[in-house]
């Protein structure tokens, strides 16, 4: 906090310019008009102030706008954005994507800070949904952004926005999130032909149900093992050996290396050993020949 002192004669700032770096903190406080500062915030971003000087400028803006900064000021905050608390940011009403981009640029290369998380939350809530342009912007700055959202938040993503999603954006998503995103992706890509469709939908398949996997197995997609290992266990279990063979194509040989890991391990336990043997991979653990398999879940449903 800088003491309130009168501005020395001749030092009253008429504009925000480089001469202000020669002002001491108390002089900045006394000689820079907050309203002038607010209208010329863009100039602050071209002047090499010290962090202490910037603290004084922030203090002046806080006094001028106790209810929160207007967007005209927010857009030009630059480094000062990093000095804001989440409480400060919750007072803002940010509607312009250009403002969002300008502030994300300041934090570029760093982890998502509490300030950035709060800013994004305010922005998305203000828009009512995660539209394509917003999602494009956010995933460009933070590839993991999508997977940081709860399933409830993801439900506000319109299918049209899914086109902006890259495979790496989904790397850290868990099954609950993919359960929400997969139907949106299916809808978004529904008019594409077989091979193109598979390329686009592949990253989302961790949310796919059994019937969709069965359908894909009829389309010669040659799913790689990495994708297969991310499928929902409950969606893989009902697949037959023939269906898995068709789904994986030449990658089926990779099952051997994964036979102790889910979902392959659990799937093997559900298959007849005879059927597994037809793959010629030496997979063990299937149901021995002559055993009868009762599906108790089906029996319960019927009763």
């Amino acid at each position: 906090e800088v003491e309130k002192t009168a501005c020395p004669s001749g030092k009253k700032a008429r504009e925000i310019d480089e001469s202000l770096i020669f002002y001491k903190k108390w002089e900045l406080e006394a000689c820079v008009d907050a309203a002038l500062l607010a209208t010329q915030m863009d100039r602050v971003n071209a002047i090499p102030f010290t962090y202490e000087q910037l603290d004084v400028l922030k203090h002046k803006l806080d006094e001028l706008y106790p209810q929160g900064y207007p967007e005209s000021v927010i857009q030009h905050l630059g480094y000062l954005f990093l000095k804001m608390s989440p409480e400060d940011i919750r007072k803002w009403n940010v509607t312009s994507l250009e403002t969002l981009k300008a502030l994300l640029e300041v934090n570029k290369g760093h982890e998502m800070s509490p300030q950035v998380a709060t800013l994004i939350d305010r922005f998305v809530k203000g828009r009512g949904q995660l539209d394509k342009d917003t999602l494009d912007t956010l995933t460009a700055f933070y590839p993991g952004y999508l997977c940081s959202l709860s399933p409830e938040e993801l439900s506000s993503v319109p299918p049209s926005s899914i086109w902006a999603v890259r495979p790496q954006d989904l790397d850290t998503c868990d099954p609950r999130q993919l359960d929400v995103l997969y139907p949106k992706a299916r809808l978004a890509f529904q008019n594409m032909n077989g091979s193109e469709y598979f390329v686009k939908i592949q990253s989302f398949l961790g949310g796919a149900p059994t019937e969709d996997l069965k359908a894909l197995s009829q389309q010669n997609v040659s799913m790689d093992l990495a994708t297969f290992m991310k499928l929902r266990t409950d969606a893989v279990l009902p697949l037959t050996v023939a269906e898995v063979q068709k789904l994986l194509g030449p990658h089926v040989e990779g099952l051997k290396a994964e036979e102790r890991h889910r979902p392959v391990r659990d799937w093997i336990l559900r298959q007849r050993q005879d059927d597994l043997d037809t793959l010629g991979l030496g997979l063990q653990g299937g149901i021995p020949n002559g055993y009868l398999v009762l599906d108790l879940s089906m029996q319960e449903a019927l009763s």
């Epitope: 090499p48 102030f49 962090y51």
Partner: nanobody, 115 residues
Framework: LQLVESGGGLVQPGGSLRLSCAAS????????IGWFRQAPGKEREGVSS????????NYADSVKGRFTVSRDNAKHTVYLQMNSLKPEDTAVYYC??????????MGQGTSVTVS
């Protein structure tokens, strides 16, 4: 973002020193740079500034005519040439920079003693 100052040392009154400011982990080329100094027990004060192109320079009254700020973008370095040094120039000298989107950087300082 970190800036690194060098070139400080002990010099006699009337002597000269050249301080350098370089960037660590990024390039200084599109950064406007300010030189500041802080004497023991005093507030940090601005000494000089230079625009990102080098076309515009400014000086505090106390160093005008004695100090010259320049930059060599090929070497990604900004310099502060200090001539006719006085005992009152004794301080830790810092550089601070501002780049695109208001990104900021500041150094840890280099000590200058005129005695």
């Amino acid at each position: 973002l970190q800036l690194v100052e060098s070139g400080g040392g002990l010099v006699q009154p009337g002597g000269s020193l050249r301080l350098s400011c370089a960037a660590s982990g990024f390039t200084l080329d599109n950064y406007a740079i300010g030189w500041f100094r802080q004497a023991p027990g005093k507030e940090r004060e601005g000494v000089s500034s230079i625009s990102s192109s080098g076309g515009s320079t400014n000086y505090a009254d106390s160093v005008k005519g004695r100090f010259t700020v320049s930059r060599d973008n090929a070497k990604h370095t900004v310099y502060l040439q200090m001539n006719s040094l006085k005992p009152e120039d004794t301080a830790v000298y810092y550089c601070a920079g501002v780049g695109a989107y208001g990104r900021r950087a500041m150094g840890q300082g280099t000590s200058v003693t005129v005695s």
